[in-house]
């Protein structure tokens, strides 16, 4: 009887986990593409709030701007370089700090996707309607978990949510 109740409890827990991570491909292009909030979502939101994604934003921004290096000194208005970097900090240091922050999401694919979406949204203001730079940023973001040694979210629609 005890064994049966433990089995039921385990099955119940599995169902909760499964429902918390179910993807809804039919959700509209505005708003989250994941199912309605659950306990898992609340936990993810708390994790996202606690995380400092700034190193990731700066790392991605620098990677994208490096691609556009030929345009560098054309516009004095452009702020670039070490804007979010600590003195003496290399790109590698910044990438490591980013990976350390993403580490908290590595066991939650849905939450990792939301973290990547948040980075994209927070940095999209920088490139605005420059589609080539935005595409480059999406490519860099898709590679980010893998570069950190984590599993990439398999179905993560980065640009589906509207940031502002």
């Amino acid at each position: 009887m005890v064994k049966l109740s433990i089995l039921v409890a385990l099955l119940g827990a599995l169902l909760v986990v499964a429902s918390a991570t179910r993807w809804d491909p039919d959700r509209g292009s505005r708003g989250s593409r994941w199912d309605a909030p659950s306990r898992g979502d609340d936990q993810c939101q708390r994790q996202l709030q606690r995380a400092n994604l700034r190193p990731c934003e700066e790392h991605i921004r620098q990677r994208v701007e490096k691609e556009q290096e030929q345009e560098q000194d054309e516009y004095p208005y452009i702020q670039r370089g070490s804007r979010g970097q600590r003195p003496g900090e290399s790109d590698e240091d910044q990438e490591q700090r980013c990976c350390n922050e993403l580490n908290r999401f590595q066991n939650n694919q849905r939450c990792m996707c939301q973290a990547l979406q948040q980075i994209l949204q927070n940095q999209s203001f920088r490139f605005q309607q420059d589609r080539s730079q935005l595409h480059q940023m999406e490519r860099e973001l898709r590679n980010l978990p893998q570069n950190c040694g984590f599993r990439s979210p398999s179905r993560c629609d980065l640009s589906s949510r509207t940031p502002y």
């Epitope: 292009s29 505005r30 345009e71 054309e74 516009y75 208005y77 452009i78 702020q79 994209l120 949204q121 999209s124 203001f125 920088r126 490139f127 605005q128 309607q129 420059d130 589609r131 080539s132 935005l134 640009s159 589906s160 949510r161 509207t162 940031p163 502002y164």
Partner: antibody, heavy 121, light 107 residues
């Protein structure tokens, strides 16, 4: 709510210069691109280009390089279009339009009311 | 530059008619297409973005379809307030362009 308010109509002589202003409100100005669109009398819409309000970098469409300058004053959420050496062919309504982001990227959901510029001697 | 060609350039229709306007790009633009409505003396009004997404507040009688080079704007049942000029606009390349416009007039 989002609003783009443009400066009033202008009557200019050929060879003169002019500046159209576009005052943005109801959103964070530096988060969205500002586009400029021209419409000559009885004609269609012509995209002139855009300015990145975060970096100040302008992009000009072909046919709008040289005499046309996009600029910003982010402290007052203003975008400007300056045209020098005005010609009769510059007579048109000039619109500013906010560029949308991510899902709606590539479209203009918010427009100024338009500024009529007449170039005549 | 990518050329956008709209057809027809003008059409006459009655209230309640189903109206279809097409827009053809000179090369593939994926789904980077928007549709606008403009009335005389007014700024354009966004109807559809990303080829088929209805802009918030736009009546559901408007719909967009297509991808690649061929796109369609459909008004399922024309209303008196729909008599206007319609423009398509591509944002695939660095330089964006509008179609020449389609004027929808009362028959």
């Amino acid at each position: 709510q989002v609003q783009l308010v443009q400066s009033g109509s202008e009557l200019k002589k050929p060879g003169a210069s002019m500046k159209v202003s576009c005052k943005a409100s109801g959103y964070t100005f530096t988060n969205y691109a500002m586009n400029w669109v021209r419409q000559a009398p009885g004609q269609g819409l012509e995209w002139m280009g855009w300015i990145n309000t975060n970096t100040g970098k302008p992009t000009y469409a072909q046919g709008f390089t040289g005499r046309f300058v996009f600029s910003l004053d982010t402290s007052v959420s203003m975008a400007y279009l300056q045209i020098s050496s005005l010609e009769a062919g510059d007579t048109a309504v000039y619109f500013c339009a906010r560029g949308e982001s991510l899902a709606a990227l590539g479209s203009f959901a918010y427009w100024g009311q338009g500024t009529l510029v007449t170039v005549s001697s | 530059d990518i050329q956008m060609t709209q057809s027809p350039s003008s059409l006459s229709a009655s209230v309640g008619d189903r109206v279809t306007i097409t827009c053809r790009a000179s090369q593939s633009i994926n789904s980077y297409l928007a549709w606008y409505q403009q009335k005389p003396g007014k700024a354009p009004n966004l109807l559809i973005y990303a080829a088929s997404n209805l802009q918030s507040g736009v009546p559901s009688r408007f719909s967009g379809s297509g991808s690649g080079t061929d796109f369609t704007l459909t008004i399922s049942s024309l209303q008196p307030e729909d008599f206007a000029t319609y423009y398509c606009q591509q944002s695939s390349s660095t330089f964006w362009t509008f179609g020449q416009g389609t004027k929808v007039e009362i028959k």
